[in-house]
Interface confidence: low
């Protein structure tokens, strides 16, 4: 991707020294999605904008890292900067306009990953299953599992078969599926995120 990382760096480099310090402090207490760790405080406070961008992307990956950065900026009262970051991140990806905010994290069911929350909708609405399989093959799907899903006759039955393997997945594996969904059917993910 790269675009999100550049947008995060651009936003952080435009903060004053005092704002950057405030950003780091807010980052220590901002609510995180379940399954994501917090950047250790001692490491965080000594970082410049470039190091912090690398850490944000390393900890949260680009998509969530940009979203989290925008949330913190908004919390600091820097609405315009947050909007610019989201606009730059979503440019050309068919995502919602920057003004539309994702629902607050507290609204999500605690402990449930996005793909578990929206299991029924994903089974019903995902059409590009083959693409997902290719993205997940060798990472979270074995050859046997890959073939088993492909053998199903319809997209819903393919997705149902795919979901039969997810109870054994950890958060990271589920994130891979979510990432693949974002890349193949971003409009569907955004629709579900707003629901």
């Amino acid at each position: 991707m790269g675009r999100a990382r550049d947008a995060i760096l651009d936003a952080l480099e435009n903060l004053t020294a005092e704002e950057l310090k405030k950003f780091k402090l807010k980052l220590l207490s901002v609510p995180l999605r379940e399954g994501y760790g917090r950047i250790p405080r001692g490491a965080l406070l000594s970082m410049d904008a470039l190091d912090l961008t690398d850490k944000l992307v390393s900890f949260y990956l680009e998509t969530y890292g940009a979203e989290l950065t925008a949330n913190v900026l908004r919390d600091m009262g820097l609405q315009e900067m947050a909007g610019q970051l989201q606009a730059a991140t979503h440019q050309g990806s068919g995502a919602a306009p920057a003004g539309i905010q994702a629902p607050p994290q507290s609204a999500a069911k605690p402990g449930l990953h996005f793909i578990d929350q929206h299991r029924a909708a994903l089974i019903a609405r995902v059409t590009n299953v083959e693409w997902l399989l290719d993205a997940l093959y060798g990472k979270v799907l074995t050859d046997e599992q890959y073939q088993a899903v492909r053998a199903e006759p319809t997209n819903p039955s393919k997705m149902r078969k795919l979901f039969s393997f997810t109870p054994a997945w950890n958060w990271t594996c589920k994130d891979l599926l979510l990432q693949a969904l974002r890349e193949s059917q971003s409009y569907l993910v955004e629709d579900l995120e707003r629901s």
Epitope: G35, Y36, G37, D54, S58
Partner: antibody, heavy 119, light 107 residues
């Protein structure tokens, strides 16, 4: 699969230095932090510090500043820890461990290197 | 530094028994806690991360819970292969700090 291969056991004299290595394979070296952990015989674990190869910026436990120097060689996917001015207190098993940032834990560990400091 | 107080220091349990190990942090660590198992002469291995997430391949008899400063590791049905030393570790702040360890033996 992910592997962290540490260098062999070391016997060193007090006052000297030693450099331990940890060769990573099976993953993108620059994408994860590598930590070093000390364990004295029959005792607990102490975090020495972490090096994050992408930005080559080590963080140290204050207790080990000046004692340990952490470096990383991206070309060989190897992390190093040099221990200086050795004393008997440095006799321990030293582990390198990959820091999985998305859960704040060490998901893979090296087999450990035993350091004995004795005259 | 954040202090991690682990208890008990040692315990013995029979096969099938439920075991609970606790860890108290000197300040709120916001779920940034992992539990490790270390068998004699081996490297530690992660069991639980982010306070309650089970690492891949770890038997489901292991579970983690807690929040704020209080956390615990539960082994639902003790097995002979669970004989080991268990450590908690906080990663909320640098330096990362470990609990003193709990040595679990088979009764």
């Amino acid at each position: 699969q992910v592997q962290l291969q540490q260098s062999g056991a070391e016997l060193a004299r007090p006052g000297t230095s030693v450099k331990l290595s940890c060769k990573a394979s099976g993953y993108t070296f620059i994408s994860f932090g590598l930590s070093w952990v000390k364990q004295r015989t029959g005792q607990g674990l102490e975090w020495i510090g972490e090096i994050y190869p992408r930005i080559d910026n080590p963080y140290y436990n204050e207790k080990f500043k000046g004692k340990a120097i952490l470096t990383a060689d991206k070309s060989s996917s190897t992390a190093y820890m040099e221990l200086r001015s050795l004393t008997s207190e440095d006799s321990a098993v030293y582990f390198c461990a990959r820091y999985f940032t998305k859960g704040n834990y060490f998901d893979y560990w090296g087999q450990g290197t035993t350091l004995t400091v004795s005259s | 530094d954040i202090q991690m107080t682990q208890s008990p220091a040692s315990l013995a349990a029979s096969v099938g028994e439920t075991v609970t190990i606790t860890c108290r942090a000197s300040e709120n660590i916001y779920y940034s806690l992992a539990w490790y198992q270390q068998k004699q002469g081996k490297s530690p291995q992660v069991l639980i991360y982010y306070a309650n997430s089970l690492e891949d391949g770890v038997p489901s008899r292991f579970s983690g819970s807690g929040s704020g400063t209080q956390y615990s590791l539960k082994i639902n049905s003790m097995q002979p292969e669970d004989t080991a030393t268990y450590f908690c570790k906080q990663a909320y702040d640098v330096p990362f700090t470990f609990g003193t360890g709990t040595k679990l033996e088979l009764k």
